[in-house]
């Protein structure tokens, strides 16, 4: 037997001006119905019946997953990072075969000294996390390594990380120019070959809240947008109140459709409202407008 779905009706006026009796289901929303056994479930738009209620897919909600949410949760990462692949040539250490083996005592000692040296070099960079040696090779010791940078996510995180990578380049260039061997001796913790410093590659975390918002909004992607509050991104439709892009429906209800946000104007005992923003009120008895 088919389940009957009670549909409440509300007397609303569309922004064109004619009074409509509309079900709470948005008739312009594509409706797909899920069937559980031989029972016709009330879950629409890809939602599924869990035995008690509809589990709706983003961006839908409601008893039957018939309504579109006003805001979608987007979760930017707490921190964002960058990885710089660098090569420097250490001249104050002679390469030995033991350095090829990452589990040897020699490698561990070199790693410790090199890390200490780089921690000194990059000490003024708040985004600096550390270094990771990826390879050591002959010449005296050519050190292929990653410089790791991290910062809190903000809308300007790319600029912050880009600036940090520039400072890394400046600092490593400076130290490898200044800390050089004199008469075959090094007075610093490590000495370098000035010409052996190279930045091979820079990888920065890619996070785009606009892209995440559009993806989650699915067929409503053109109508959801990202606004920031306290440097946190919010994925909202114009029906969400309190934002710059919020639609003011005055005497009406904002509702999302595939054509965007629209105002469904209310009719009260004394007035009926019309206009795109339901701001044109007409008194039923006197028929005069007031704005």
């Amino acid at each position: 037997p088919l389940a009957t779905i009670p549909v409440s009706t509300t007397s609303l006026t569309s922004s064109e001006g004619s009074t409509i009796s509309t079900p709470s289901v948005d008739i312009s929303t594509p409706v797909t119905t899920s069937i559980v056994g031989d029972q016709c479930s009330r879950c629409k738009n890809g939602g599924f019946w869990d035995g008690l209620k509809c589990q709706c897919l983003t961006p839908y909600y409601g008893e039957s997953c018939e309504e579109v949410v006003n805001s979608i949760d987007i979760a930017p990462p707490e921190t964002v990072s960058a990885q710089m692949e660098l090569t420097v040539t250490v001249t104050s250490v002679k390469f030995t075969d033991e350095l090829k083996n990452h589990s040897s005592q020699e490698f561990r000692e070199f790693n410790k000294t090199f890390t200490e040296q780089m921690n000194i070099v990059y000490s003024g960079i708040p985004e600096y996390v550390g270094v990771n040696i990826t390879n050591l090779r002959l010449g005296s010791v050519v050190v292929e390594h990653d410089v790791l940078l991290r910062t809190k996510y903000t809308p300007e995180y790319k600029t912050a990380l880009d600036n940090a990578t520039e400072v890394v380049k400046q600092k490593i260039t400076k130290v490898t120019t200044e800390q050089i061997m004199t008469n075959d001796n090094c007075s610093a913790l490590m000495c370098f070959n000035t010409t052996g410093t190279q930045v091979q590659n820079i990888t920065v975390t890619q996070y785009d809240p606009v892209e995440e918002c559009r993806q989650k909004a699915e067929e409503y992607e053109d109508y959801f947008l990202v606004e920031y509050r306290d440097q946190k991104p919010y994925c909202i439709s114009p029906c969400e109140s309190g934002f710059n892009a919020s639609k003011n429906c005055n005497h009406g209800k904002c509702q999302m459709s595939q054509n965007g946000a629209r105002c469904l104007c209310v009719t009260t005992e004394t007035h009926w409202y019309s206009g795109e923003d339901c701001n044109q009120g007409t008194q039923k008895s006197h028929h005069h407008h007031h704005h």
């Epitope: 104050s92 030995t96 033991e98 005592q105 000692e109 410790k112 001796n185 610093a188 913790l189 490590m190």
Partner: nanobody, 123 residues
Framework: DVQLVESGGGLVQPGGSLRLSCAAS????????MAWFRQAPGKEREGVAF???????SYAESVKGRFTISRDNALSSLWLQMNSLRAEDTAVYYC?????????????????WGQGTMVTVSS
């Protein structure tokens, strides 16, 4: 575990000689770098000399021609022969070692250290 033990310090008159020894245990004697450092009262620790596993040596300008560093890989021993000693050579002398073939007398580059032996040059 690497252990370094110095000996041979003492009181000597200006112009005299002393031979310091350092016995290394747990250290792969055929590898790395061994060095002598010294610290005079109220002064920073400074590098005196170092010797690599292949016998390559280097000296601080202030001791060149007067001090000689040597090592015996088979005995895991390090020596510092000090001649023509001066009052300014008075200090605690430390033996230090690194598993790496180093070309630096920067103390921070040496992870292994002895307790030190006192050398006093006075008349």
């Amino acid at each position: 575990d690497v252990q370094l033990v110095e000996s041979g310090g003492g009181l000597v008159q200006p112009g005299g000689s002393l031979r310091l020894s350092c016995a290394a245990s747990g250290f792969p004697s055929s590898r790395g770098t061994m060095a002598w450092f010294r610290q005079a009262p109220g002064k920073e620790r400074e590098g005196v000399a170092f010797i690599n596993s292949d016998g390559r040596t280097s000296y601080a300008e202030s001791v060149k021609g007067r001090f000689t560093i040597s090592r015996d890989n088979a005995l895991s021993s390090l020596w510092l022969q000090m001649n023509s000693l001066r009052a300014e050579d008075t200090a605690v002398y430390y033996c230090a070692a690194s598993l790496l073939y180093l070309m630096t007398v920067n103390a921070a580059a040496y992870p292994y250290w002895g307790q030190g032996t006192m050398v006093t040059v006075s008349s």
